[in-house]
Structures are given as structure tokens and as C-alpha cells.
């Protein structure tokens, strides 16, 4: 109708001005639209400059919406990580505090003279939990070797024990089992418990990091055009009241977020593996009962050594020869009473159960995050039409949207009518993050089986990192061993951890 050809652009002026743009750009009345590059070229209230400004704005608004959704998920994962991390660290710190409080009374100089060895063990356990690249079994073996050497000297102050004799003692140790069953039990249980705890917390870190990195992936130019058409072309074409058709919006965002949707399978695998590994938090080899009770195994070990002292000495002499006696030294150390300590099994505090049930629920809630993202953004951010199908904005006019809704992921966008997607060019950042998810899932599966995987990263660039910054100080390049000088590749998923305590030692 010829009269409508010179419709006023008042509504567009209002919306455009509200966006912070200069009103001098807006024509008073509709103009011919041959200059439009994105919107349909009918009569329009938008100049080229306005179209460009609104295209940039719509692009920025979608990126903001995407980042907001990601931030909510990141915050949830970060809160979970902090809660579990605090709990696990608390268990270990509690055990160390108990040891420091009870061992001097229970074992006297057998403890105080070796406080450094015990402190080092807890430091190593803490570092291992936080993602340091050390071998837990080796660390424990070296602790026992070191402790045996020192305690044997203490229990036999009358003997001259040169380094070569102590070397021999060390070689005999495995057969002699001087500490009874405690080292073996601790090794089996601690390996399972620490592997489970650290891989679970690392999983949370990796998940959070993937979300953060993916949120930074820029939307391409084809997406920008499609989003402009979706959000602002209705204004330019004089139907500002028309809201986007739901299926139209979904197709645009499925095209824009095609690469992100490809995270879905590995994301689900990761979250499933994390939920699964929480099974390992319970029972006698569970995280709570083991990490919180390290000191009780240590007490059992010292008691066993004292009980076995005479047999042990006889066997050592048999294997290593008769050591010289220090004429000025005293007789053998008096047998101390057995160190009495609280029973090994810690009653569960209930904290971990609560943390796990919350985590399971929240992880289940976000399992379909990546494939539900287009729908979520459309319904929450795009002010979709609730009107009947033929009253919504379909990208060309007010009316029905006929094309079918595309499937999820890059491959399914081959015929997306709204966004031209090159399915042969997947986004490399997202491919790397898929790889990070795979690696972490494999770690969790190994951890579920009680295995401490060799933390070698197969990532393309090693860019994935559990806490966002890679390793804490230089934890990851270290490989502790008094005997060997082998080293492993750095671990790229470290944990946020406590600052290392630097107290004055009391020996």
C-alpha cells in the first residue's frame, strides 16, 4: 500500500538510540533498501551504517550471552572444585596435625628425631594430590627406606653403621618387612584413594577450563550475519514488534554453535566418569578413611618395628655382617611402650556425602549443556515469539518458519538454511578441548581401576589446564627419587593448592 511506503521510523529510532547509537544516523521515514547487505532489501529504516552497527551489536550480544551462560557453569564447577579440594586437603592436614600432636608422646625420640621425614611425607602426599608429577608408590617406598635407616640407627646407638652398611640394610628391607603390613596396606589404599581424589578434582578443573576456553572462541562472520538477521532485521524492515520464530532462532544458533555442540559426547563421558569415581570415596580404601588416617598407618609401622626389633636385627646381621660396636656408645635403646593411637577407621563426618550428592546432581544437570545451549540462549536471551507460527519473524518477514530444525554438531549443519557452515573446517580450539576431555576421561577411568596413570598429555599443544594456569610453581617438572634420576613429562592439569607451609621444624 503506497501510504505505508513512507512509514515513520520512530520505533526504530527509539530502539537504536537506546542502544547508545547516534540518532542522527536514523532516517525520519523509510527509505529504499538496496544498500542493505544483510537484511532483506525492501523498504527500510536502516542505513548501511546502522546495519553495520546493529550487526556488530548483535554479534557482541550473542558473545556476551554465551559468556554469561559459560560463566554460570564455570562458577558451579569452580565452587565444586573448591569444596572438594578444601575437604581433601583438610583430611590430610588433619592427619598431619594429629601426628604432630600425638607422636611425640607416643614415640618420643623415635618421632622427634625423624619429624623431618614425616613432614616430607605429608608434603609429598600433598603435592601428589595437587597434581605433581611424582610416582606415589616410589615416594612411599623411599619414605619407608629413609625411616628404616634412621630408626635402625636410633634403636642401635651402640652400633657403628657406616653408609655401606645402611645401603645393605636398605637392600634387605623388602624381604625383612621391618614395618609389618603397614607399608603394603598404606601403599595399596593410599594409591587408590589419592588417585581417586586427585583425578576427581582434576576432572572438575579440566571441565571448568574447557568451558572457559570454549567461551573465548570467536563467532565467525557467517554467524554474525545470521544473528543480525535474526535479531535486528525485523526492526530495519519496519516490523519491530515481530519476535523471532523459535525454530528459526534454533537453526541460527545451531549453526553458530555447531563446533561447541561437538563437545557433547566427550563432555558427557567426562561427567559420567566423574560421577562414577565418587564410588571410590567410600569404604575402607575410600578417600575419607584413608587420607584422614595416614598417621595411624605410620603409628602401626613404628609399633611393628619396635615389636620386631630383635628378629630384625638378627636378620640384618645375618645378611649384612656384624657391625662394629662403639665402645663409648650405650646399650641398645630401651624398648618403648607401644604408641597408643585412635583406631584407624575415621567415622565419616557426613561432609563428603553431602558434597558428593550435590556434585552428582549438579553434574547431571549440566550434562547436556553444549547441545542445549542454542535452545537455552534462544529461550532466555532472544525474546522468542510466543505468538502463533505465522506471526513471528522468520528472517524475511512476519510469518511462518518452514525449514526443519537442524541436528546438533558440525556435520549436521551441512544444509543449515540460516548459517553457511563449512563442515570441513572444525574449530581447532574446540578440537583441542575435545582432546582434553578425552584425556581426562581416560585418567578418571584408570583411576577408577585404582591405577595411577602415567600423566603424559596427548594434547596437541598441551594447552589444557585444570586450574587455568597449568602447574603450581614448578611442581610438574619434578620427579622425586633418591635413587633414580628418571623424569616424566610435565603434567598440564595441576590443582589449586595450599601454599606450602614453611614452619620452623622441631626435631
Amino acid at each position: 500500500d503506497p501510504a505505508s511506503k513512507s512509514r515513520s521510523c520512530g520505533e526504530v529510532r527509539q530502539i537504536y538510540g537506546a542502544k547508545g547509537f547516534s540518532l542522527s544516523d536514523v532516517p525520519q521515514a523509510e527509505i529504499s533498501g538496496e544498500h542493505l547487505r544483510i537484511c532483506p532489501q525492501g523498504y527500510t529504516c536502516c542505513t548501511s551504517e546502522m546495519e553495520e552497527n546493529l550487526a556488530n551489536r548483535s554479534h557482541a550480544e550473542l558473545e556476551t550471552a554465551l559468556r554469561d551462560s559459560s560463566r554460570v557453569l564455570q562458577a558451579m564447577l569452580a565452587t565444586q572444585l573448591r569444596s572438594f579440594d578444601d575437604h581433601f586437603q583438610h583430611l590430610l592436614n588433619d592427619s598431619e596435625r594429629t601426628l604432630q600432636a600425638t607422636f611425640p608422646g607416643a614415640f618420643g625420640e623415635l618421632y622427634t628425631q625423624n619429624a623431618r621425614a614425616f613432614r616430607d611425607l605429608y608434603s609429598e602426599l600433598r603435592l601428589y594430590y595437587r597434581g605433581a608429577n611424582l610416582h606415589l608408590e616410589e615416594t612411599l617406598a623411599e619414605f619407608w627406606a629413609r625411616l628404616l635407616e634412621r630408626l635402625f640407627k636410633q634403636l642401635h646407638p651402640q652400633l657403628l653403621l657406616p653408609d655401606d652398611y645402611l645401603d645393605c640394610l636398605g637392600k634387605q628391607a623388602e624381604a625383612l618387612r621391618p614395618f609389618g603390613e603397614a607399608p603394603r596396606e598404606l601403599r595399596l589404599r593410599a594409591t587408590r584413594a589419592f588417585v581417586a581424589a586427585r583425578s576427581f578434582v582434576q576432572g572438575l578443573g579440566v571441565a571448568s577450563d574447557v568451558v572457559r576456553k570454549v567461551a573465548q572462541v570467536p563467532l565467525g562472520p557467517e554467524c554474525s550475519r545470521a544473528v543480525m538477521k535474526l535479531v535486528y532485521c525485523a526492526h530495519c524492515l519496519g516490523v519491530p514488534g515481530a519476535r523471532p520464530c523459535p525454530d528459526y532462532c534454533r537453526n541460527v544458533l545451531k549453526g553458530c554453535l555447531a563446533n561447541q555442540a561437538d563437545l557433547d559426547a566427550e563432555w558427557r563421558n567426562l561427567l559420567d566418569s566423574m560421577v562414577l569415581i565418587t564410588d571410590k570415596f567410600w569404604g575402607t580404601s575410600g578417600v575419607e578413611s584413608v587420607i584422614g588416617s595416614v598417621h595411624t598407618w605410620l603409628a602401626e609401622a613404628i609399633n611393628a618395628l619396635q615389636d620386631n626389633r630383635d628378629t630384625l636385627t638378627a636378620k640384618v646381621i645375618q645378611g649384612c655382617g656384624n657391625p662394629k660396636v662403639n665402645p663409648q656408645g650405650p646399650g641398645p635403646e630401651e624398648k618403648r611402650r607401644r604408641g597408643k593411637l585412635a583406631p584407624r577407621e575415621r567415622p565419616p563426618s557426613g561432609t563428603l556425602e553431602k558434597l558428593v550428592s550435590e556434585a552428582k546432581a549438579q553434574l547431571r544437570d549440566v550434562q547436556d549443556f553444549w547441545i542445549s545451549l542454542p535452545g537455552t540462549l534462544c529461550s532466555e536471551k532472544m525474546a522468542l515469539s510466543t505468538a502463533s507460527d505465522d506471526r513471528c519473524w522468520n528472517g524475511m518477514a512476519r510469518g511462518r518458519y518452514l525449514p526443519e530444525v537442524m541436528g546438533d554438531g558440525l556435520a549436521n549443519q551441512i544444509n543449515n538454511p540460516e548459517v553457511e557452515v563449512d563442515i570441513t573446517k572444525p574449530d581447532m580450539t574446540i578440537r583441542q578441548q575435545i582432546m582434553q576431555l578425552k584425556i581426562m576421561t581416560n585418567r578418571l577411568r584408570s583411576a577408577y581401576n585404582g591405577n595411577d596413570v602415567d600423566f603424559q598429555d596427548a594434547s596437541d599443544d598441551g594447552s589444557g589446564s585444570g586450574s587455568g594456569d597449568g602447574c603450581l610453581d614448578d611442581l610438574c617438572s619434578r620427579k622425586v627419587s633418591r635413587k633414580s634420576s628418571s623424569s616424566r613429562t610435565p603434567l598440564t592439569h595441576a590443582l589449586p593448592g595450599l601454599s606450602e607451609q614453611e614452619g620452623q621444624k622441631t626435631s
Epitope: 616430607d120 635407616e149 610453581d473 633418591r482 635413587k483 633414580s484 614453611e502 622441631t506
Partner: antibody, heavy 119, light 107 residues
């Protein structure tokens, strides 16, 4: 063979800080504690503290606790000792020394670094 | 703090002499004691650990004895290269402490 190579001599003004390095080779760096011992001209030996290169844990002599910081870099097998708020009585040769085994006894020593504090 | 007291602070000897240096701890340190030799401009060198065990590579004319609080370093027959300063050190508790040193001089 085990070698500890320290950084060169330093001249500092009172109130300044000095950071001495000690690069280790010939053994597993993370397997043995490293200590710092100083010796003022014509005087005896004074223990300053130790660092566990494996964990970074440190223990300092109370006398230096407020002024000394020991750190390590496992990638270069190097330990560092930083002493702040220097005064003239800190003029000394500073040695790094590696424990023999887990026994607080020093089997290997660096060549020493002379730090002179003078206005 | 465990204080280590060495005596004498210096001793003059001729080549071939027997020299004895003593070290006393302010409290019992069992056998946690080491002896070092230091020559001018050089770093100390370990001779004895665990009070009486000779370090590999140290000459057999050096010997250590003692337990608890009283310790002795003996050079059975002083050689020209033995003229140096000797320090004892306790390794039982922090802070680790050294004796004040004993200078063995040529008579």
C-alpha cells in the same frame, strides 16, 4: 660426580638484598636436602637453613628467619638463597652444602660466594 | 639450641705428632656428630660422620669417638696437608650448629 657451582662474588650496600645461586649436577637433585652455611672473615661456620628441593619445604635458623628466603628451580637443578636488609656483619662467604644422605651431615659443598656489605 | 664447644681453639704440632681435638655438646646428641676440615680459601670437607665413621676418601689417620655429649677427633700422625682448621657439627636438632673451630698449626 656431584658438583655444586655457586654464583660469583657480590658487593652490596647496607639495607639491600642479595640472591646467591647454587647449581647442582651429578645426582638426582630432588633426592637430597640442600643447606646454606655462612662464614664471616676469620670466623667459624654458621648454619642458615635448608630446603627440600623435592617439595620446596624450608627450615630456617631462627636468627635469619625474618630475612632469609630459600627457593629452588627443579628445571635447572638450582637452589637460591636470598638475604634481605643486609648489614655490614653479613659480610661473609656463603656456602651451599648438600646432605650426605638423610642425616644433616654435609658431604658436598659449593665453592662459596663472597658477599661484601659496605657503604 | 644445642651449643657446641671445641677445644683447644688452636694447637701447634709437628709432622708425625698425635693430635686430639675435643668437642662438647650442651645436651646429649647421641651419635649425631660430624667433623670437617677446612683450609684457607676453601670449602669445608667432611672427615667423620655418626661421631666415629670415617667418610669414604678421608685418610685413615683420622678417627672419631664419643657419644652423648663428649666427642674427640684424633689425628694419629699429623701430615703436612693436615694443617688446617677443624669443626665439629651436631645434626640432632635444629638449628644445626658448629663448634667454634680448632686451628692445627705447624709448630
Amino acid at each position: 660426580q656431584v658438583q655444586l657451582v655457586q654464583s660469583g662474588a657480590e658487593v652490596k650496600k647496607p639495607g639491600a638484598s642479595v640472591k646467591v645461586s647454587c647449581k647442582a649436577s651429578g645426582y638426582t637433585f630432588t633426592g637430597y636436602y640442600m643447606h646454606w652455611v655462612r662464614q664471616a672473615p676469620g670466623q667459624g661456620l654458621e648454619w642458615m637453613g635448608e630446603i627440600n628441593p623435592s617439595t620446596g619445604d624450608t627450615t630456617y635458623n631462627q636468627k635469619f628467619k625474618a630475612r632469609v628466603t630459600m627457593t629452588r628451580d627443579t628445571s635447572t637443578s638450582t637452589v637460591y638463597m636470598e638475604l634481605s636488609s643486609l648489614r655490614s656483619e653479613d659480610t661473609a662467604v656463603y656456602y651451599c652444602a648438600r646432605e650426605k644422605r638423610d642425616d644433616g651431615v654435609f658431604a658436598y659443598w659449593g665453592q662459596g660466594t663472597l658477599v661484601t656489605v659496605s657503604s | 639450641v644445642i651449643w657446641m664447644t671445641q677445644s683447644p681453639s688452636s694447637v701447634s704440632a709437628s709432622v708425625g705428632d698425635r693430635v686430639t681435638i675435643t668437642c662438647r655438646a650442651s645436651q646429649a646428641i647421641n651419635g649425631w656428630l660430624a667433623w670437617y676440615q677446612q683450609k684457607p680459601g676453601k670449602a669445608p670437607r667432611i672427615l667423620i660422620y655418626s661421631a666415629s665413621t670415617l667418610q669414604t676418601g678421608a685418610p685413615s689417620r683420622f678417627s672419631g669417638s664419643g657419644f652423648g655429649t663428649d666427642f674427640t677427633l684424633t689425628i694419629s700422625s699429623v701430615q703436612p696437608e693436615d694443617f688446617a682448621t677443624y669443626y665439629c657439627q651436631q645434626a640432632k636438632s635444629y638449628p644445626l650448629t658448629f663448634g667454634g673451630g680448632t686451628k692445627v698449626e705447624i709448630k
